[in-house]
């Protein structure tokens, strides 16, 4: 948990953050793990510590190894480990897997590719971007702040993207490159404000005392894979788990995707052995996603076991 892999290329700048976090005012000491030798803080050194950051300006293959950082708060010392590997520059264009940062996915609506680790560096715009080693040219590509935007993304835009920028330290410039894969999602999904299909707003559900009852909360959130969507039940404004009535439980229903492509979710509320006091509760079906929350309220009413209607007025 408190160990982090970092990598870079020889003769480029590499800045590593201690995996243990702390207030900016905390002292952080860095050591070579093997020798326990302290890493200097003087900036005249090629490798030096600067608070939570360890800086290799520039990095050398021999710098590879494990580094220990100790974050010293007034109350605790917390230890972290940075596993650093510096690789020789490749002569050919291929970027090996071990130099790749996490893959990002894009679609027609969202095609941002963030330059990995750039927030650790003192850099100035613009960034240079390359795809499969070719400099990106054309109006479809826009380097904006720390990310690349691709207009009208097509499946052919998938590939390895490298950002290149200059880190400045006390007037000296150092080059940094970072590469990640970009994949294009075919599905043109979208999300919208939740639509609750059931129950109807202010629905009255008839139940029989002593019998079991089920209430289904069903809502749709858009088309395609939804980043964040949930349906749940509340009792008198309280989560089911916090309400503390073991007879009343919620159970996830089917994740539905209808023929029209809508992504919908169900949550079934199961009430065992319905009691009189259950009729006094307010049952809220909640559907929420990034757009917001929609709530439909249901109340229970007593259904007589034999409901004979009088034929007399």
């Amino acid at each position: 948990k408190f160990s982090k892999q970092s990598w870079g290329l020889e003769n480029e700048a590499l800045i590593v953050r201690c995996p243990r976090q702390g207030k900016p005012s905390y002292t952080v000491d860095w050591y070579y793990s093997q020798t326990n030798k302290s890493i200097p803080t003087q900036e005249r050194n090629r490798v030096f510590a600067s608070g939570q950051l360890l800086k290799f300006l520039p990095a050398a293959v021999a710098d590879s190894g494990i580094y220990t950082c100790i974050v010293r708060s007034p109350t605790f010392n917390r230890t972290g480990y940075a596993n650093v590997t510096i690789y020789k520059k490749q002569s050919d264009c291929n970027v090996p897997d071990y130099l790749m940062y996490s893959t990002v996915s894009g679609s027609e609506k969202n095609s941002k590719i963030y330059c990995p680790t750039i927030d650790l560096y003192n850099w100035t715009a613009p960034l240079e971007w390359f795809k499969n080693c070719q400099a990106l040219q054309g109006s479809r590509y826009r380097a904006h702040k720390s990310f690349l935007v691709i207009d009208n993304v097509m499946t052919e835009d998938a590939g390895d993207y490298t950002c290149k920028f200059i880190h400045n330290e006390n007037g000296a410039n150092y080059s940094v490159t970072a590469t990640r894969s970009f994949t294009v999602k075919d599905e043109q999904g979208f999300s919208l404000f939740p639509v609750i299909g059931a129950p109807a707003q202010n629905e009255i559900k008839e139940v029989e005392i002593g019998k079991n009852a089920n209430l289904t909360c069903s809502a749709c959130f858009g088309k395609g894979t939804q980043f964040l969507a949930a349906v749940l039940w509340q009792l008198n404004g309280t989560k089911i788990t916090d309400f503390g009535e073991p007879r009343i439980q919620q159970e996830e229903g089917q994740n539905q995707s209808f023929s029209n492509g809508l992504a919908c979710l169900d949550m079934v509320l199961r009430i065992a052995d319905v009691k009189e006091e259950d009729l006094l509760l307010q049952y809220d079906c909640l559907a929420l996603n990034l757009h917001g929350l929609r709530r439909h309220t249901v109340r229970l009413s007593r259904k007589n076991p034999i409901d004979h209607h009088s034929i007399y007025c």
Epitope: Q21, K23, P74, F76, R78
Partner: antibody, heavy 121, light 107 residues
Framework: QVQLQQSGAELVRPGASVTLSCKAS????????MHWVKQTPVHGLDWIGT????????AYNQKFKGRATLTADKSSSTAYMELSSLTSEDSAVYYC??????????????WGQGTSVTVSS | DVVMTQTPKFLLVSAGDRVTITCKAS??????VAWYQQKPGQSPKLLIY???NRYTGVPDRFTGSGYGTDFTFTINTVQAEDLAVYFC?????????FGGGTKLEIK
């Protein structure tokens, strides 16, 4: 939402011990330190100590060292403080408070409702 | 231990007044100072952290400043709901210590 639910009021005899609990919910228990603070009308707020629930490491105010024992149960997200050899000076309201040290805001950003302890024979 | 000397102990003000509370540390505590508000019958609430940063949801009439040993907390336009005790606290060195508190009363 973040909540720190403390145990109920205690009436204890001098010389006895008391254990107070603080149940955390609405956040990752191990990502924050849990601190304990004593409040009396005369002395105001007094920091007792802190526990890192991730590791179980503790740090105490020398004033309370040896009498206060802080523990944490990760499985139930509950912090405990045991105070021993009680005297009337220990009659106070005791608060548990979450301390954010990894990201802003840095400080005691959420407090329990407090537990009143009365030491009396 | 770092002693946080908070003044004044009491403040009697009218709604709309500007209020200033000071806290003096017995040694430098950098900017590791927080300010808390405690309303009657309630737990303390964080208002200011890192000497001058307003906590989420805190109205902008509350401000903090200072560095080293001298810290100031200001309420620009006091409102009736600001009736409370205000505490400063340092977390620069252990044990963390609090000021004695300032009781704010509204005329």
């Amino acid at each position: 939402q973040v909540q720190l639910q403390q145990s109920g009021a205690e009436l204890v005899r001098p010389g006895a011990s008391v254990t107070l609990s603080c149940k955390a919910s609405g956040y990752t228990f191990t990502d924050y330190e849990m601190h304990w603070v004593k409040q009396t009308p005369v002395h105001g707020l007094d920091w007792i100590g802190t526990i890192d629930p991730e590791t179980g490491d503790t740090a105490y105010n020398q004033k309370f060292k040896g009498r206060a024992t802080l523990t944490a149960d990760k499985s139930s997200s509950t912090a405990y403080m045991e105070l021993s050899s009680l005297t009337s000076e220990d009659s106070a309201v005791y608060y548990c408070t979450r301390y954010s040290y990894t990201n802003s805001p840095y400080g005691m950003d959420y407090w329990g409702q407090g537990t009143s302890v009365t030491v009396s024979s | 231990d770092v002693v946080m000397t908070q003044t004044p102990k009491f403040l009697l003000v009218s709604a709309g007044d500007r209020v200033t509370i000071t806290c003096k540390a017995s040694q430098s505590v950098s900017n590791d100072v927080a300010w808390y508000q405690q309303k009657p019958g309630q737990s303390p609430k964080l208002l200011i952290y890192y000497a001058s940063n307003r906590y989420t949801g805190v109205p902008d009439r509350f401000t903090g400043s200072g560095y080293g040993t001298d810290f100031t907390f200001t309420i620009n336009t006091v409102q009736a709901e600001d009736l409370a005790v205000y505490f400063c606290q340092q977390d620069y060195s252990s044990p963390y210590t609090f000021g004695g508190g300032t009781k704010l009363e509204i005329k």
